[in-house]
């Protein structure tokens, strides 16, 4: 059967079901794509205009293809195999009641199945497989592809080899003034700012134009490459570094023994497998942890999560999100949010963006 002959695939959500919040639809669809990108070299990005490879549509009855929907129950959705035009598109029956949970029909689980078709998979005869033809709710927080699903998709696209996963496959030093440069994590350390990318970090001393690039392993040999989040509690001379479900504590620029530890010791639920970004605000003595399109707030004095979290990033940080790469705190009033090659200066007192910059604007580029 057909496959996509490229590894960067775009998708667009044509319209939204009224059954769910738009943010929840975006999140469910993004997480469904992520299920497949986690086990392949494929990368998916959402576009809001123009022609995407995969169009996501909510429709009822006859809707422009040969396969009219049948009302509530029965056929929940269908998707076309890879190709141009309608190829790859995923259609969801609007007569179903779409949900984020076990009631109605779970959009995430259905989307994982349909995206499997969009990528070229047929149905599986293994009842444990997501590509099994009948819908069955499973706990989405512990959802995993079956071995059969993984075998099937990797037979089409291969596995996510390390050099395919890295945006910088040969691990060479990224070009600092590349306008498309993005960062994995950013944090202050005293009067310096550390910018992490792959196995490197740049050191920017405040108000000085000069920056230097270093290997993470040259400063901290016991730490991994690909740091994903970082924050500083300056009053304690502490820096926390995160990768996957682990974190390391650096005190006075030295790694503490008995690390790494699990991020779940902060109180995250089990489905959180990694942190995208983190920032400590000394005025509130709170750390904000950003995970996908949500954030948690952690009380550093009481060493526990504040109640009422997670919350949606887009709801509480106007103009930011739905997802961020990195963030740091500066000048007692700003968060600097990084999204791809863009950076947003955000006044947390006024609660709005005050400046939009390129991510590498700190380096005099």
């Amino acid at each position: 059967g057909p496959v996509w002959r490229k590894h960067y695939i775009t998708y667009r959500i044509n319209n939204y079901t009224p059954d769910m919040n738009r943010e929840d639809v975006d999140y469910a669809i993004r997480k469904a794509f992520q299920v497949w990108s986690n086990v392949t070299p494929l990368k998916f990005s959402k576009i809001n205009t123009g022609m995407a490879d995969i169009l996501v549509v909510f429709a009822r009855g006859a809707h422009g293809d040969f396969h009219a929907f049948d009302g509530k129950g029965g056929i929940l959705a269908h998707a076309f195999g890879p190709g141009s035009g309608i190829g790859g598109d995923a259609h969801f029956d609007e007569d179903e009641f779409w949900t984020t949970h076990s009631g109605g029909t779970n959009l995430f689980l259905t989307a994982v199945h349909e995206i499997g078709h969009s990528l070229g998979l047929g149905h599986s005869s293994d009842p444990k497989a997501v590509m099994f033809p009948t819908y069955k709710y499973v706990d989405i927080n512990t959802f995993r592809l079956s071995a059969d699903d993984i075998r099937g998709i990797q037979s089409l696209y291969g596995d996510p080899k390390e050099n395919q996963r890295l945006p910088n496959p040969d691990n060479s030093e990224p070009a600092l003034c590349d306008p498309n440069l993005s960062f994995d994590a950013v944090t202050t350390v005293g009067n310096k700012i550390f910018f992490f990318k792959d196995r490197f970090f740049w050191l920017k001393v405040s108000e000085r134009p000069k920056t230097s690039v270093n290997l993470i392993s040259s400063l901290w040999p016991t730490l991994p490459s690909g740091i994903e989040a970082a924050y500083e509690i300056e009053a304690r001379n502490q820096v926390f570094l995160f990768k996957d479900d682990k974190y390391w504590l650096i005190s006075n620029l030295r790694p503490e023994p008995n690390y790494p530890k699990s991020i779940h010791s902060f109180g995250f639920p089990n489905f959180v497998k990694k942190i995208d970004a983190a920032v400590f605000n000394p005025r509130f003595y709170r750390t904000y942890f950003f995970v996908d399109n949500q954030y948690w707030r952690y009380d550093e004095r009481r060493q526990m999560m504040d109640p009422g979290y997670p919350k949606l990033i887009t709801k509480n940080f106007q103009g930011i999100g739905p997802k961020i790469d990195a963030v740091f705190y500066s000048k007692n009033k700003y968060y600097y949010f990084f999204q791809g090659s863009n950076q947003f200066e955000y006044d947390f007192l006024l609660q709005r963006i005050t400046k939009t910059l390129k991510s590498n604007s700190w380096f005099g580029c």
Epitope: A62, F66, G81
Partner: antibody, heavy 122, light 103 residues
């Protein structure tokens, strides 16, 4: 080179039967949806029927449902249309057309045969 | 059920003219619309698929646009070989056709 060649047309009386064939070459026939589209003399195009790559899914226009049967033999790279209870209004040139690969039909007809004329008349 | 309305049903134009044919659906069909050209005694030929994508081998003077319910086929500069009948189509439904004739 993709080629589709229809055969089996001819003159038949109302109420009679006819079986059309479409021989395919130049592509992996068993991967593709296939369709029949017809055109009455001096009129526009009308979709008649479609069949999935394995033959497990078939679709028909309301005007032929219950009278026509689409089928395929992937070992022979051939598409068929069995037409029963023929009526005068079934008189047309019948084209076979190739659609896309995959579990569902896109209705995107990228290759067509030259057609075979079916005339239903007493 | 979805219906397709094509207009005009016939059109007279000269070589070099810019010509536009429209197709309207009675409900959204997203970008799932194709255009075909048919010459007398010949099989139809796919020109445009998915509303705006040019089929391989089709001259660039042909273009398509639209999404939802309203679609357009444009021939930027008519050539003698372009005089034919044009059909829009989505799934099992064809428009009535537009016969393009020499003025």
């Amino acid at each position: 080179e993709v080629q589709l060649l229809e055969s089996g047309g001819g003159l038949v009386q109302p109420g009679g039967s006819l079986r059309l064939s479409c021989a395919a070459s130049g592509f992996t026939f068993s991967d593709y949806w296939m369709h029949w589209v017809r055109q009455a003399p001096g009129k526009g195009l009308e979709w008649v029927s479609g069949i999935s790559p394995s033959g497990g899914m078939t679709m028909y226009a309301d005007s032929v449902k219950g009278r026509f049967t689409i089928s395929r033999d992937n070992s022979k790279n051939t598409l068929y249309l069995q037409m029963n209870s023929l009526r005068a209004e079934d008189t047309a040139v019948y084209y076979c057309a190739r659609d896309i690969v995959g579990p569902y039909s896109a209705g995107l007809f990228d290759y067509w045969g030259r057609g075979t004329l079916v005339t239903v008349s007493s | 059920d979805i219906q397709m309305t094509q207009s005009p049903s016939s059109l007279s134009a000269s070589v070099g003219d810019r010509v536009t044919i429209t197709c309207r659906a009675n409900q959204s069909i997203y970008t799932y619309l194709n255009w075909y050209q048919q010459k007398p005694g010949k099989a139809p030929k796919l020109l445009i698929y998915a509303a705006s994508s040019l089929q391989s081998g089709v001259p660039s003077r042909f273009s398509g646009s639209g999404s939802g319910t309203d679609f357009t086929l444009t021939i930027s500069s008519l050539q003698p070989e372009d005089f034919a009948t044009y059909y829009c189509q989505q799934a099992g439904i064809f428009g009535q056709g537009t016969k393009l004739e020499i003025k």
